[in-house]
């Protein structure tokens, strides 16, 4: 994750001395502050090469992120700079200093230079973490077409402000675990994975904890892959119709297709008393087909006005694309004007590859 997508006016600079190894310093800064984290060598001895890490990912120096062997500066701090920072020995990856940094909306006043008081006292009683919007976290299964982006959210609160970490299938999940990495937004309690692929499928758990307790939520991600197919026609359409002589009738056909579909409406006819030709293909007449100014929406409806007995019979919606054809058929029954309407049976469905 790149540090910093938010630059604000630089306020004060707050330099924070490093904690004893093994301790975690909880720090709060205002938006726009310059965050300075200091990690002197233990016992004042030589330190050797070090790396600064945020949320498990090594920090890359930039015009805004200044990395030194004993000091890290993040200018114009913003929400996205919140997270877990550590200074580690490059060779052993031993953690020398560890900081939990939170950047709040309001620029800090300058009174709490190290921000420790603010981290511990948010004005409410101390307590274990809790979900702030549980009613908006009901979606446990996320089915996402490949190449799109996923965002898991676990908005929480507590005092002291809890930390959030993520697991995939029960194991710690970090950016280096997937091609393309991950993006963490601690302020938004969220994990983002861009351009998902099938290997991203699994169970993702957010773990939110402070010293008073821990809560977790698990989401299941399914990455959907598409194989090309012939058009899909909505079940039950067109529906059988019974109409009174002289009335108007509409048949509907809903077509789903990746490749551009070609839609036709056909009426089955008899030729020399036969409904099918020598090869078994039905005799049909084309009632409606795509024209220069015909939209797909218009093609999905066949309108028959002032129906006669000759209009009775079988009608077919035929849809084809570069993969193949599908068709559904329905029957029209025309009754004399004085007879009551009688519902016909449901339409049958036929597919052709």
């Amino acid at each position: 994750e790149s540090l910093g997508t938010e630059q604000r006016v630089v306020g004060r600079a707050a330099e924070v001395p490093g904690p004893e190894p093994g301790q975690q310093e909880q720090l709060v800064f205002g938006s726009g502050d310059a965050v300075e984290l200091s990690c002197p060598p233990p016992g004042g001895g030589p330190m050797g090469p070090t790396v600064w890490v945020k949320d498990g990912t090594g920090l890359v120096p930039s015009e805004r992120v200044l990395v030194g062997p004993q000091r890290l500066q993040v200018l114009n701090a913003s929400h996205e700079d919140s997270g877990a920072y550590s200074c580690r020995q490059r060779l052993t990856q031993r953690v020398l200093c560890h900081f939990s940094v939170r950047v709040t909306d309001a620029p800090s006043s300058g009174d709490d230079e190290d921000g420790e008081d603010e981290a511990e006292d948010t004005g409410v009683d101390t307590g274990a973490p809790y979900w702030t919007r549980p009613e908006r976290m009901d979606k446990k299964l996320l089915a996402v077409p490949a190449a799109n982006t996923v965002r898991f959210r676990c908005p929480a609160a507590g005092n002291p402000t809890p930390s959030i970490s993520w697991l995939k299938n029960g194991r710690e999940f970090r950016g280096e675990h997937r091609i393309g990495g991950i993006k963490l937004r601690h302020q938004q309690w969220s994990l983002v994975m861009e351009s998902v692929v099938p290997s991203d499928r699994g169970n993702y758990t957010c773990v939110v904890e402070n010293k008073f307790g821990s809560i977790r939520q698990t989401y299941t991600l399914d990455v959907l892959e598409r194989s090309p197919h012939r058009p899909i026609l909505q079940a039950g359409l067109p529906a059988n119709q019974t109409a009174v002589l002289g009335s108007d009738v509409e048949f509907h056909c809903k077509v789903y297709s990746d490749a551009q579909p070609h839609i036709q409406w056909l009426k089955h006819v008899e030729v020399n008393g036969s409904k099918v030709g020598p090869d078994g293909t039905p005799y049909v007449t084309v009632l409606k087909t795509a024209g220069a100014n015909t939209t797909d929406k218009e093609l999905e409806v066949l309108s028959l006005h002032n129906v006669t007995f000759e209009d009775a019979g079988e009608y077919t919606c035929l849809a084809g694309n570069s993969i193949g054809f599908s068709h559904h058929s329905a029957w029209l029954v025309v009754l004399p004007a004085e007879e009551e309407l009688v519902e016909a049976d449901e339409a049958g469905s036929v597919y052709a590859g």
Epitope: E6, M137, A147, R151, Y219, E225, S257, D258
Partner: antibody, heavy 127, light 107 residues
Framework: EVQLVESGGGLVQPGGSLRLSCAAS????????ISWVRQAPGKGLEWVGR????????NYADSVKGRFTISADTSKNTAYLQMNSLRAEDTAVYYC????????????????????WGQGTLVTVSS | DIQMTQSPSSLSASVGDRVTITCRAS??????LAWYKQKPGKAPKLLIY???FLYSGVPSRFSGSGSGTDFTLTISSLQPEDFATYYC?????????FGQGTKVEIK
Amino acid sequence: EVQLVESGGGLVQPGGSLRLSCAASGFTFTSTGISWVRQAPGKGLEWVGRYWAWDGSTNYADSVKGRFTISADTSKNTAYLQMNSLRAEDTAVYYCARTYGIYDTYDNYTEYVMDYWGQGTLVTVSS
Amino acid sequence: DIQMTQSPSSLSASVGDRVTITCRASQDVDTSLAWYKQKPGKAPKLLIYSASFLYSGVPSRFSGSGSGTDFTLTISSLQPEDFATYYCQQSTGHPQTFGQGTKVEIK
């Protein structure tokens, strides 16, 4: 490299029709979508509609609903904007843009992001 | 429809200046907001999505923040190529709607 190229623009009389094409390369439609956005001369951007390839669904701005139709032929990696009953106020540069979704667990909504755009094609509706 | 209102409509600035553009939605759009940059005669380019995510390849001097109804695009140190018109756009509601644009001109 992702590229989108629009074509089919031109001069058309009020009430007339025009079909714009958007040829894509460097990606396939099957999991993402194509949006159309227009910009009248000297004005801001206006979203026209979107084709979502996964389910073949389309969405339109109220100003074009019933007149414009978006479709796609994934075998040709091309999207189309069929414009009927054109009016003078439809005069604009029309852009197509690759569109992907951000699927969110929060409230189960999808945010649509237009990340690659074509160069645009000018449609002029005038008598 | 959700109305998006940008301010200012235009501004004059010099190279190296820090520039802030705001965008206000007529109703809550959570973080479903993108920022685009457009130069005359050219197509728009995506800068920021989901309110604060920097799109790949976009310089880190661009940043976005906000959620709900109030959003900000910040350019920390204006460069010559940044003189353009900037648009915000929401996509949580239907239809997707753009702000009217903010033109950043050379002082």
